[in-house]
């Protein structure tokens, strides 16, 4: 397993609809054709997997149907969008990139992006 540099922004603000996007850039040492991207959430020293996708270079990222993540790729850069976030989901979101094929296998883990989520104000009761 060889190490690879992964860059991501330190901070991002989620929209009032609970959508946050951030870029994950990796310094590919070779010509990878198959790449796996995993988003991890670190909170209170616990790390959990948020979502993961494997894609072929030049193709779209395909997450599972029930995933809260979507993404697009362009060269060595992946634009990740996480939806359905609430205030309790505020935390450090780490981008993990694996170059699966061809060998050698490379692994890179970013420093993490702090996503700040604020729950929207509840709509006032309406007479209509």
């Amino acid at each position: 397993c060889k190490a690879m540099h992964v860059a991501q922004p330190a901070v991002v603000l989620a929209s009032s609809r609970g959508i946050a996007s951030f870029v994950c850039e990796y310094a590919s040492p070779g010509k990878a054709t198959e790449v796996r991207v995993t988003v991890l959430r670190q909170a209170d020293s616990q790390v959990t997997e948020v979502c993961a996708a494997t894609y072929m270079m030049g193709n779209e990222l395909t997450f599972l149907d029930d995933s809260i993540c979507t993404g697009t790729s362009s060269g060595n850069q992946v634009n990740l969008t996480i939806q359905g976030l609430r205030a309790m989901d505020t935390g450090l979101y780490i981008c993990k990139v694996e170059l699966m094929y061809p060998p050698p296998y490379y692994l890179g883990i970013g420093n993490g992006t702090q996503i700040y989520v604020i729950d929207p104000e509840p709509c006032p009761d309406s007479d209509f």
Epitope: A7, A10, V11, L13, S15, V23, E25, N111
Partner: antibody
């Protein structure tokens, strides 16, 4: 390499507005928040607020709330800061800055507010 | 609103070592505050030295290093040079905003 280039110096009258631009290059503009920072003559650096160019989400320091507006034009990778109802104590240098794991600053725009 | 505290001034001899600190009124500074250190010389724009605790900019000399020390962010200069004489600002991130300290005036004498 990453560069942030700001617009030129401005002289304004009290009560007027000023709009400063910051052109970014050398990185994915929509991928990183852009901050605006003020430095009054002989004073400390003061955070004005930030904008997320990807979704236009802004957060302004309470002190500037209601007087400042941030916008971006992603097609030309440029961020803008507009400050209205200018007062003499708004005189200072205004910086755009990408504050991050790797941080970058613009060269600054001097705004002078004088009657 | 959090307050970020720095030493108003420090003096170091050429070739000596000095540590500048950056504290937070809300408690211990952590990596989640993404401490940023900025150098500013008179009449010049600020220049980032270190971001996210210990990530050096490409132009940052090796003698500068960032760390967390006793609940504070710290900038250490090992082997100070006359050109290091400047104002040093620290910025900390608090969930959705940055707060700057009022700077440390470093004199190399």
């Amino acid at each position: 390499q990453v560069q942030l280039v700001e617009s030129g110096a401005e002289v304004k009258k009290p009560g007027a507005s000023v709009k400063v631009s910051c052109k970014a290059s050398g990185y994915s503009f929509t991928g990183y928040t852009m901050n605006w920072v003020r430095q009054a003559p002989g004073q400390c650096l003061e955070w004005i607020g930030l904008i997320n160019p990807y979704n236009n989400i802004t957060n302004y320091a309470q002190k500037f709330q209601g007087r400042v507006t941030f916008t971006v034009d992603t097609s030309i990778s440029t961020a803008y800061m507009e400050l209205s109802r200018l007062r003499s104590d708004d005189t200072g240098v205004y910086f755009c800055a990408r504050l991050d794991y790797r941080s970058y600053w613009g060269q600054g725009t001097l705004v002078t507010v004088s009657a | 609103q959090a307050v970020v505290t720095q030493e108003p001034s420090l003096t170091v001899s050429p070739g000596g070592t000095v540590t500048l600190t950056c504290g937070s009124s809300t408690g211990a500074v952590t990596t989640s505050n993404f401490p940023n250190w900025v150098q500013q010389k008179p009449g010049q724009a600020p220049r980032s030295l270190i971001g996210g605790t210990n990530n050096k900019a490409s132009w940052t000399p090796a003698r500068f290093s960032g760390s967390l020390l006793g609940g504070k962010a710290a900038l250490t200069i090992s082997g100070a040079q006359p050109e290091d004489e400047a104002e040093y600002y620290c910025a900390l991130w608090y969930s959705n905003h940055w707060v700057f300290g009022c700077g440390t005036k470093l004199t190399v004498l």
